[in-house]
């Protein structure tokens, strides 16, 4: 039967449509086996896979999807949305203890790295030749940043600056990276989230790093101190270009909400960071840059600034895109998609 | 969501000049392109221009150039439609509509409509 | 500029009847993006028009689901499975993947 919407994460999902959000129509699932299997863990029920009918195979978060044959877009998600009076299905299950967000075995950090000064994730977006917002770069082709930063289609008018402090790159001529953007992945409905990828991989270097993505689902105390940086307004009439930093604290949805007044209801894919400093935080033209964290002397990105309800208000805690609950579609689509070889 | 609250209808004689604003509300107005379509009465719709109030980048359809220009005050929130030297043709109703971003591109706020009618 | 065809001009229908509305372009709306930028609107009387599906397929928020989109390339379909009598109005079906964007000329729903 044409079903027209789906419950839980739409895993049991058996209608016919077969288009993706884009307007692409779908390829058939057989077509595709041996990619599912070599990039995406998954329990294969083959009966299910049918046609090329959007389906979930891969218990995705956000719903079901489907291939297209569009090496542009070799999966997206489907317009199907939740069946009425279907609740999101939660990412933290109280249950079991809450997963930490740094990426740990048996207690070791891997890859943790004392704290340091280096913020050479730090990306400059430009439109036009100008800084239009932040982002972070978590693999060499690969930056996260928000939606909102890209008013145009056409890729020729962007591209990343990397390994700057300065926003103009005045005393970075060293370090500074220029690289063209070449294509722009959205996230799932509603998060903001852009994947931007880059023409050909960032050099790692001194001035140019990676910063680590949280673990899918994972909780972060309350009270964490975390950073936000950008380029963005600043209130200062001679601005001197250089990359600032707030500093804030992790705080409780429930406890953000109320400091909100109670007209804001975060989601589970929302994050809440308060500042340390009355009236600090992240502002126009830091749209896209990250809510940094350290756990486990490990820096994270957990969070991603998007526009908001005004500018560093006093008392009003900044509300975040919540990275862990997209860490999960960051992984598939850096697994998925086709990146320019060094 | 947002609202766009525009200005009210216009009488206005052959070869004058009028300009309309649209106040917006309710979502950050310096991220989202602000559009300008047209409506003749019984007719259907036409493109005008748009204008992104974060740079003050324009689009225009080659029809309108000249006849309008397109300005954004982002303290305001409030986006401008100039229309020069007119005729009975540019009688009609005018809407101002926000251009959500990728990977979107559609008119998802609408203003109610400002009438301009042109006659001697 | 692209024109957008759409047919029939007026379409009477009866209340619970299956509508269908078609939709032509005069080139190609895939974006060299792999995105279609189709999207259909709805004016009703006295009324500025409403989002209802965008890019082809997508159901706008709070739209029914007895709306539906399909197509691609240059041939798009608005289906309405049930009409009820808060569907009557002008549809306009509208692309923005080129510059300048274009709306169809609109298509009626009336009752028979």
């Known amino acids: 039967s044409g079903q027209d919407c789906y419950r839980g994460n739409g895993k049991n999902y058996m209608g016919q449509l077969s288009q993706t959000r884009s307007g692409l129509t779908c390829s058939m699932w057989d077509k595709n086996m041996e990619d599912l299997h070599r990039h995406i863990f998954w329990e294969p029920d083959a009966s299910k896979l049918n046609e090329n009918y959007c389906r979930n195979p891969d218990d995705d978060a956000h719903g079901p999807w489907c291939y297209t044959g569009n090496p542009l877009i070799p999966w997206d998600y489907c317009p199907i949305s939740r069946c009425e009076g279907d609740t999101t299905p939660g990412i933290v299950n109280l249950d079991h203890p809450v997963i930490s967000c740094a990426k740990t075995i048996e207690g070791r950090v891997v890859n943790g790295i004392p704290t340091r000064t280096n913020i050479g994730w730090m990306v400059s977006l430009r439109y036009r030749n100008k800084h239009i917002c932040g982002g972070s770069l978590i693999k060499e082709s690969w930056v996260l940043t928000a939606r909102q930063c890209f008013p145009s289609r056409d890729l020729k008018d962007y591209e990343a600056w990397l390994g700057i402090h300065d926003v103009h790159g005045r005393g970075d001529e060293k370090c500074k990276q220029v690289l063209q953007v070449s294509q722009l992945v959205y996230g799932p409905e509603g998060s903001d989230l852009v994947l931007m990828k880059l023409a050909r991989p960032a050099v790692l270097d001194d001035f140019v790093s990676t910063i680590d993505l949280p673990n899918y689902g994972c909780t972060i105390p309350e009270k964490t101190s975390c950073s936000v940086y950008g380029w963005g307004y600043t209130g200062l009439i001679n601005y001197d270009g250089l990359l600032r930093v707030a500093h804030l604290y992790i705080m409780g949805n429930e406890k953000c909400s109320q400091h909100h007044r109670g007209k804001v209801t975060l989601q589970e894919s929302e994050i809440c960071a308060g500042a340390e400093k009355i009236g600090s935080g992240p502002c126009e033209g830091d749209y896209g840059g990250p809510l940094v964290c350290e756990q486990h002397k490990m820096r994270m990105v957990l969070g991603v600034i998007v526009p908001g309800r005004g500018c560093a208000i006093p008392n009003r805690p900044g509300i975040f895109v919540r990275v862990a609950y997209y860490a999960k579609w960051i992984h598939k689509i850096i697994l998925t998609y086709k990146v320019p070889q060094s | 969501q947002g609202q766009l609250q525009q200005s009210g209808p216009e009488l206005v004689k052959p070869g004058a000049s009028v300009k309309i604003s649209c106040k917006a509300s309710?979502?950050?107005?310096?991220?989202?392109?602000m559009n300008w379509v047209k409506q003749r009465p019984g007719k259907g719709l036409e493109w005008i221009g748009r204008i992104y109030p974060g740079y003050g980048d324009t689009n225009y359809n080659g029809k309108f150039k000249g006849k309008a220009t397109l300005t954004a005050d982002k303290s305001s929130s409030t986006a401008y439609m100039q229309l020069s030297s007119l005729t009975s043709e540019d009688s009609a109703v005018y809407f101002c509509v926000r251009e959500e971003l990728g990977p979107y591109w559609y008119f998802d706020v609408w203003g109610a409509g400002t009438t301009v009618t042109v006659c001697s | 500029d692209v024109v957008m065809t759409q047919t029939p001009l007026s379409l009477p229908v009866s209340l619970g009847d299956q509508a269908s509305i078609s939709c032509r372009s005069s080139?190609?709306?895939?974006?060299?993006?792999?995105?279609?930028?189709l999207h259909w609107y709805l004016q009703k009387p006295g009324q500025s028009p409403k989002l209802l599906i965008y890019k082809v397929s997508n159901r706008f928020s709070g739209v029914p689901d007895r709306f539906s989109g399909s197509g691609s390339g240059t041939d798009f379909t608005l289906k309405i499975s049930r009409v009820e009598a808060e569907d009557l109005g002008v549809y306009f079906c509208?692309?923005?993947?080129?510059?300048?964007?274009?709306f169809g000329s609109g298509t009626k729903l009336e009752i028979k």
């Open positions: 309710g979502y950050v107005f310096s991220s989202s392109w």
């Open positions: 509208s692309q923005s993947t080129h510059v300048p964007y274009t």
């Open positions: 080139q190609s709306l895939v974006h060299s993006n792999g995105n279609t930028y």
